[in-house]
Interface confidence: low
């Protein structure tokens, strides 16, 4: 499976959507900031094998598509943004799901290392628990797009480094 | 083997809701979402939307929104699916489908219930 | 919405000829998610193809399928009296996922 130069274009261009979408100061939010706890490990990519990290990306992408596919999100967010947001992740979705299928192969092989996926969808459980919290308050959702800008950039060098991997 | 067993035929009447449900066994229940998709007599198929069974996060088609509600119980790997002010042309038999990758999505459907909805 | 249009809406043949239904799509499809499912009378409908050429687990070999973007066909080679059946195309590649209306083969 060969995640190629246009997945890491998708990538780039995720990042800078993201970047686009901050509608106030992280300063003036500073009181709101909060430790996501997110899954470092997880993307550290030298203990397993393609196919579980990928597993692991592919989770990382629809974790953050159903994240920012919510009504409250579509209430946050420039529409236009948020649909090429969606655009962007879907392709990257697309792209790994096609390596999973090379990578696995077998029908019956669950996503990958259950462990690995739920730590990853607990940090998302945090960050939506977080969401409620705070009400959906712009500050929370500018805490939250920070952080995803930041896992975004962990999914990206773990990218990266499979590609080097090829 | 992966097996989707369905609760049995529904008779309603306009504007009651109907639930159907979806016992999934034979494999990791929160590894896969669960889709439903429906059938009016001699009509195509129509996909209705998707529950992840994991935390319960749905995705819906426009079509149904507001109508429908999906919701799983991890205790007992059963999804529902849930149609509320139900109408005539509401008549069809309900699926549910299992989701996954290349080969293994909507590979397995569930036996089908019929809901009829009558005066 | 991706309108996926099938044709013909009946296609009427005896068995040993090849069958050829069709399946445009209304904006570009990723093939990746371009799906064939065969469904009989009172039955569920049962997967044929996925990945638009791809067999799925226990399908004869006389099915195929072909295409790409908006174009998508469903082959079989030599008909057998079992599958005379009515055939969804189907495509998870963007929201909300949609089938064809489906083409009825059946004998001549």
């Known amino acids: 499976c060969n995640l190629s130069q246009t997945h890491s274009l998708n990538n780039r261009r995720t990042l800078m959507l993201m970047a686009q979408m901050r509608r106030i100061s992280p300063f003036s939010c500073l009181k709101d900031r909060h430790d996501f706890e997110f899954p470092q490990e997880e993307f550290d990519g030298n203990q397993f094998q393609k196919a579980q990290a990928i597993s692991v990306l592919h989770e990382m992408m629809q974790q953050t598509f159903n994240l920012f596919s919510t009504k409250n999100s579509s209430a946050a967010w420039d529409e236009t943004l948020l649909e090429k947001f969606y655009i962007e992740l879907f392709q990257q979705m697309n792209d790994l799901e096609a390596c999973v299928i090379q990578e696995v192969g077998v029908e019956e092989t669950p996503l990958m290392n259950e462990d690995s996926i739920l730590a990853v969808k607990k940090y998302f459980q945090r960050i939506t628990l977080y969401l409620m919290e705070k009400k959906y308050s712009p500050c929370a959702w500018e805490v939250v797009r920070a952080e995803i800008m930041r896992s975004l950039s962990f999914s990206t060098n773990l990218q990266k480094r499979l590609r080097r991997k090829d | 083997q992966v097996q989707l067993v369905q609760s049995g035929a529904e008779v309603k009447k306009p504007g009651a809701s109907v639930k159907v449900s979806c016992k999934a066994s034979?494999?990791?229940?929160?590894?896969?979402?669960m889709h439903w998709v429906r059938q009016a007599p001699g009509q195509g198929l129509e996909w209705m939307g998707e529950?992840?069974?994991?935390?319960?996060?749905?995705i819906y088609a426009q079509k149904f929104q507001g109508r429908v509600t999906m919701t799983r119980d991890t205790s007992t790997s059963t999804v529902y699916m849930e149609l509320s002010s139900l109408r005539s042309e509401d008549t069809a038999v309900y699926y549910c489908?299992?989701?996954?990758?290349?080969?293994?999505?909507?590979?397995?459907w569930g036996q089908g219930t019929l809901v009829t909805v009558s005066s | 919405e991706i309108v996926l249009t099938q044709s013909p809406a009946t296609l009427s043949l005896s068995p040993g000829e090849r069958a050829t239904l069709s399946c445009s799509a209304g904006?570009?499809?990723?093939?990746?998610?371009l799906y064939w499912y065969q469904q009989k009378p009172g039955q569920a409908p049962r997967l044929l193809i996925y990945?638009?050429?791809n067999l799925a687990s226990g399908i004869p070999a006389r099915f195929s399928g072909s295409g790409s973007g908006t174009d998508f066909t469903l082959t079989i080679s030599s008909l057998e009296p079992e599958d005379f059946a009515v055939y969804y195309c189907?495509?998870?590649?963007?929201?909300?996922?949609?089938f064809g209306q489906g083409t009825k083969l059946e004998i001549k």
């Open positions: 489908a299992r989701g996954g990758l290349g080969p293994a999505w909507f590979a397995y």
């Open positions: 034979g494999y990791t229940f929160t590894n896969y979402w």
């Open positions: 529950i992840n069974p994991s935390h319960g996060r749905t």
């Open positions: 904006s570009s499809v990723d093939s990746s998610y």
């Open positions: 990945s638009t050429s």
């Open positions: 189907h495509q998870w590649s963007s929201y909300p996922f949609t």
